[in-house]
Amino acid sequence: LTCLGGFASPGPVPPSTALRELIEELVNITQNQKAPLCNGSMVWSINLTAGMYCAALESLINVSGCSAIEKTQRMLSGFCPHKVSAGQFSSLHVRDTKIEVAQFVKDLLLHLKKLFREGQFN
């Protein structure tokens, strides 16, 4: 989590700040949504438990050509300790359930806001 700020950042970003920024990006996506997000692309649903950042990234990384979620993908990679590539799946995916990216983002946002409120940043 220490390098989430990227090159523009003067130093390490506290986990709470990184999570707040991810939440704010997801809020932007949900609020600025006019046409169906990512043309209504479907992604694997995930269990919102430990390891969910990597699982979320593994789901979203399979959506290509959707600029609206590119920043989210980059931010999630900062929370995931290992490199994630398209086609990768963890046990946290609910492999029989696909949902629209818009619903995925909404569910993730709700969960992350509660984690922030409870002080769970990692």
Epitope: P14, T17, L19, L110, K113, K114, F116, R117, G119, F121
Partner: antibody, heavy 120, light 112 residues
Framework: EVQLVESGGGLVQPGGSLRLSCAAS????????IHWVRQAPGKGLEWVAR????????KYDPKFQGRFTISADNAKNSLYLQMNSLRAEDTAVYYC?????????????WGQGTLVTVSS | DIQMTQSPSSLSASVGDRVTITCRSS???????????LEWYQQKPGKAPKLLIY???NRFSGVPSRFSGSGSGTDFTLTISSLQPEDFATYYC?????????FGGGTKVEIK
């Protein structure tokens, strides 16, 4: 319109049990936290418990843990407070309240309260 | 548990007066996420509480500008700049940073 309506209060003998209900409308309880707060006659407010209906993450004031149980029924969009081994000092108006839905910073809506009287 | 101590417990004031209520927490109520979840609620007899101020100094929507909150660390203040007839009520501070969440004992504002 957001609304919280408590019910289930009444007169109960010491040692008895009571189940309070809080019916929510105008929002989905899974999107926020719901709390129970009580107020003894002529006294101040006292936070009792909180539930996250999305995952049943529950927190209590330790003084109520073991006797009181908070729960949610997402299908009915309702919350409950099961109170056991009631004592005279549990006599109070019981309110349910929700945390606002953006960052859960505060209680923005409260029910009207339901009075619980514990007496023989 | 964090104790929230309000003072005074009651006060008598006249319409137009400036009223200050203080709330002291027994330890810091800064949450691990950096926020300070200190709120002020107003309650009238037989009614549910109503939010006035959240996160120390933010006025809730619809709350008149005569209500303001300030403070940091463990010391917090609710100020009513010019008391109005509808402001006679009981005021509670509340900390929502650390479980168990706790209210102050209340301050009853009465007509002089």
């Amino acid at each position: 319109e957001v609304q919280l309506v408590e019910s289930g209060g009444g007169l109960v003998q010491p040692g008895g049990s009571l189940r309070l209900s809080c019916a929510a409308s105008g929002f989905n309880i899974k999107d926020t936290y719901i709390h129970w707060v009580r107020q003894a006659p002529g006294k101040g407010l006292e936070w009792v418990a909180r539930i996250d209906p999305a995952n049943d993450n529950i927190k209590y004031d330790p003084k109520f843990q073991g006797r009181f149980t908070i729960s949610a029924d997402n299908a009915k969009n309702s919350l409950y407070l099961q109170m056991n081994s009631l004592r005279a000092e549990d006599t109070a108006v019981y309110y349910c309240a929700r945390s606002e839905e953006n960052w859960y910073d505060f209680f923005d809506y409260w029910g009207q309260g339901t009075l619980v009287t514990v007496s023989s | 548990d964090i104790q929230m101590t309000q003072s005074p417990s009651s006060l008598s004031a006249s319409v137009g007066d400036r009223v200050t209520i203080t709330c002291r927490s027994s330890q810091s109520i800064v949450h691990s996420n950096g926020n300070t979840y200190l709120e002020w609620y107003q309650q009238k007899p037989g009614k549910a509480p109503k939010l006035l101020i959240y996160k120390v100094s933010n006025r809730f929507s619809g709350v008149p500008s005569r209500f303001s909150g300030s403070g940091s660390g463990t010391d917090f203040t609710l100020t009513i700049s010019s008391l109005q007839p509808e402001d006679f009520a009981t005021y509670y501070c509340f900390q929502g940073s650390h479980i168990p969440y706790t209210f102050g004992g209340g301050t009853k504002v009465e007509i002089k």
